[in-house]
């Protein structure tokens, strides 16, 4: 859960309590056990800009 009083993370990222900052959901491919990855499952990824 995101820390109270912090700005929401941008699309494609999720709050990490461990690191005290927003982290990229893309990194959950390599590190699925990261605390913030739970928040990524509920949020759609940022779309590709082609």
């Amino acid at each position: 859960e995101q820390a109270p009083g912090t700005a929401p993370c941008s699309r494609g990222s999720s709050w990490s309590a461990d690191l005290d900052k927003c982290m990229d959901c893309a990194s959950c491919r390599a590190r699925p056990a990261s605390d913030f990855c739970l928040g990524c499952a509920a949020a759609p990824p940022a779309p590709f800009r082609l």
């Epitope: 005290d20 982290m23 893309a26 491919r29 590709f48």
Partner: antibody, heavy 119, light 111 residues
Framework: EVKLQQSGGGLVQPGGSMKLSCVAS????????MNWVRQSPEQGLEWIAE??????????HYAESVKGRFTISRDDSKNSVYLQMNNLRPEDTGIYYC??????????WGQGTTLTVSS | DTVLTQSPASLVVSLGQRATISCRAS??????????IHWYQQKPGQPPKFLIK???NRDSGVPARFSGSGSGTDFTLNIHPVEEDDTAIYYC?????????FGAGTKLELQ
């Protein structure tokens, strides 16, 4: 402010050894994968070693070019990462950078240290 | 290993114009959601500086003049308008697998 302060390097003869060190500050060191990347005119930027986290018993990965000769290690209590280089070859000459990544990109780099392997 | 081929090797651009740098991977480095390509800028005597992650996401503090795009095997870094301070070598890097490899670099110079 994130800082990676490197030490070590210099001139060494072929077949010799050298140890590089890198002390980190300004971020939660124990959560990050630590790496060594080297740069030479011949090979460009070349990733050479990575050490991951204590929670997984510090797994390591190496480039084929250094496997069996180089050893990466870390001391989370000292926010430090090391590269022990043995049986050095002239082609190991270059600038060595320590760099951290959470999973994918190298967001912070040390200032670099030069290694010259020559007789 | 995934090989990254950058082109051109060098590029001369006038102040205020657009610089376009290509990075082609030897295999796809994208999932349906993300592309695992990142861009760096290196100036003489300095370490590489991280610019763009996951093909198109600028690092904090990186000017909007820098933009990245692409998916699969073909990726592009655009700089527009080019400023004097942009003279540097630009590298792409993939994180699809071990080993993470870098492109050979593109040297950007101003006319």
């Amino acid at each position: 402010e994130v800082k990676l302060q490197q030490s070590g390097g210099g001139l060494v003869q072929p077949g010799g050894s050298m140890k590089l060190s890198c002390v980190a500050s300004g971020f939660t060191f124990s959560y990050y994968w630590m790496n060594w990347v080297r740069q030479s005119p011949e090979q460009g930027l070349e990733w050479i070693a990575e050490i991951r986290l204590q929670s997984n018993d510090y797994p390591t990965h190496y480039a084929e070019s250094v496997k069996g000769r180089f050893t990466i290690s870390r001391d989370d209590s000292k926010n430090s990462v090391y590269l022990q280089m043995n049986n050095l070859r002239p082609e190991d000459t270059g600038i060595y950078y320590c760099a951290c990544r959470y999973a994918d990109y190298f967001d912070h780099w040390g200032q670099g240290t030069t290694l010259t392997v020559s007789s | 290993d995934t090989v990254l081929t950058q082109s051109p090797a060098s590029l001369v651009v006038s102040l205020g114009q657009r610089a376009t740098i290509s990075c082609r991977a030897s295999q796809s480095v994208s999932t349906s959601d993300y592309s695992y390509i990142h861009w760096y800028q290196q100036k003489p005597g300095q370490p590489p500086k991280f610019l763009i992650k996951y093909a198109s996401n600028r690092d904090s503090g990186v000017p909007a003049r820098f933009s990245g795009s692409g998916s699969g095997t073909d990726f592009t870094l655009n700089i527009h308008p080019v400023e004097e301070d942009d003279t540097a070598i630009y590298y792409c890097q993939h994180s699809w697998e071990i080993p993470p490899t870098f492109g050979a670099g593109t040297k950007l110079e101003l006319q």
